[in-house]
Interface confidence: low
């Protein structure tokens, strides 16, 4: 029998889906970290569904996330990083649905910023640089990024470039002259922690000179 | 019933290799980090090595770093200590223990009765 | 890495005395310390985790305190079967690292 049989609002609950999913982030406020989670299903009723993770804390056995519109979240500086939590999705006391999750292997790096792209025209190249706040952290230090670049006019036609330092150098032959271009960067954990890429940074936009006609080469 | 049995100990000349073994039943193995402690005769307990559930995570007491090496596999429910370029000074009884971080910190709230390694000429 | 020093490191004492163990940390390791209990020929047994949270089944009169670095384990009222050897721990989650005190070896007077 259902446990929520003098309860009409709740007596369909069961058959709702219930699945969601989480990130953390790891310092993210000073030593602070942040634990995020949603519903996988957008039209779920959350009206008194909370969510709860329990173990591989710190001190406590147990914490409540706070709710902010349609996603829930915690921040605190009580995870142990070792282990796995149990999250749970709850209606008063019962729990809907579990999830066992290590902490560490759901990591969402903050977006780079600071993205910028400077021409040397001796260089006949573009130096592309950005910034990321994991440099000076504890934990998530060490981070594969992406670096997405298009042709204004090709929507869809992105080139990517993996790399783990901050710095990139793109060849001026290998993009269009005179072409406006728009740059953009994500990071995901590498090395121990593991999880999903982050928000793309803010795009910049650059142009490519023309070409000199003389020479071949661009202006 | 939680338990842990270590195997694997012996009588060894120093510079050769010795494998030490950790079978674990009664709890859900591959929630745990698991630890290797060992204890000298007559003296205290000296942390070895230990790994996170998912073997991502290990750490080795600076004594036996490079020399040895903790390994799990999570489907025989087993912890391993491969421990080579033995020396006298490894002689000890090892003990493997389970980490219970649910608690909230690091305790070892499971211990085997420990294997004996003798590194002697 | 942090060091635990245990004081004293060895005590004598009467059934029903009052004793106390201190273990001080080279730095800050806020409440991550557990206290041990081994005895001979036996292994080792958690007593006390996060500080002063008594593990199940272990009774009342062992209680701990402390934190940052002054961490003290007591026994209040000592029963024949305390006599042993108290061990406290502390851990560091990443990188993954265990450190144990020297030990307190406490014996029948």
């Known amino acids: 029998e259902s446990g929520y049989a003098q309860n009409g609002d709740l007596e369909d609950a069961e058959l709702d889906d219930y699945s969601f999913s989480c990130y953390s982030q790891l310092e993210v406020n000073g030593s602070q970290h942040s634990l995020t989670c949603a519903f996988e299903d957008p039209d779920v009723n959350t009206t008194n569904l909370e969510f709860e993770i329990c173990g591989a804390l710190v001190e406590v056995k147990c914490l409540n996330f706070r709710k902010l519109q349609e996603i829930y979240f915690i921040e605190t500086k009580k995870f142990l990083l070792i282990g796995k939590s149990n999250i749970c999705v709850k209606v008063g006391e019962k729990s809907l649905t579990c999830k066992k999750i290590d902490l560490t292997t759901i990591v969402k790096p903050e977006a780079p910023f600071d993205l910028s792209v400077i021409y040397r025209e001796g260089a006949n190249d573009f130096v592309v640089t950005f910034n990321t706040s994991h440099l000076q952290k504890k934990y998530v230090k060490v981070l594969m990024h992406d670096v997405a670049y298009r042709q204004e006019k090709d929507e869809n036609k992105w080139t990517h470039v993996n790399l783990s330092s901050t710095k990139l150098t793109l060849l001026q032959r290998k993009l269009q002259p005179a072409a406006m271009y728009e740059i953009k960067v994500r990071s995901i954990p590498d090395h121990y922690f593991k999880g999903f890429w982050s928000e793309w940074s803010p795009s910049y936009y650059f142009r490519t000179p023309e070409i000199n006609n003389s020479s071949g080469e661009m202006d | 019933e939680v338990q842990l049995v270590e195997s694997g100990g012996g009588l060894v000349q120093p510079g050769r290799s010795l494998r030490l073994s950790c079978a674990a039943s009664?709890?859900?193995?591959?929630?745990?980090?698991m630890h290797w402690v060992r204890q000298a005769p007559g003296k205290g307990l000296e942390w070895v090595s230990g790994?996170?559930?998912?073997?991502?995570?290990?750490g080795y007491a600076d004594s036996v770093k490079g020399r040895f090496t903790i390994f799990r596999d999570n489907a025989k429910n087993s912890l391993y200590l491969q421990m080579n370029s033995l020396r006298a000074e490894d002689t000890a009884l090892y003990y493997c223990?389970?980490?219970?971080?649910?608690?909230?910190?690091?305790?070892?709230?499971?211990w085997g009765q420990g294997t004996t390694v003798t590194v002697s000429s | 890495a942090i060091q635990l020093t245990q004081s004293p490191s060895s005590l004598s004492a009467s059934v029903g005395d009052r004793v106390t163990i201190t273990c001080r940390a080279s730095?800050?390791?806020?409440?991550?310390l557990a206290w041990y209990q081994q005895k001979p020929g036996k292994a080792p047994k958690l007593l006390i985790y996060?500080?002063?949270s008594l593990e199940s089944g272990v009774p009342s009169r062992f209680s701990g305190s402390g934190s940052g670095t002054d961490f003290t384990l007591t026994i209040s009222s000592l029963q024949p079967e305390d006599f042993a050897t108290y061990y406290c721990?502390?851990?560091?989650?990443?990188?993954?690292?265990?450190?144990f005190g020297q030990g307190t070896r406490l014996e029948i007077k």
């Open positions: 223990a389970k980490d219970e971080y649910s608690r909230g910190y690091y305790v070892l709230d499971v």
């Open positions: 009664g709890f859900t193995f591959d929630d745990h980090a």
């Open positions: 790994i996170s559930w998912n073997s991502r995570g290990i």
């Open positions: 730095q800050g390791i806020s409440s991550a």
């Open positions: 996060a500080a002063s």
């Open positions: 721990q502390q851990f560091n989650s990443y990188p993954l690292w265990i450190t």
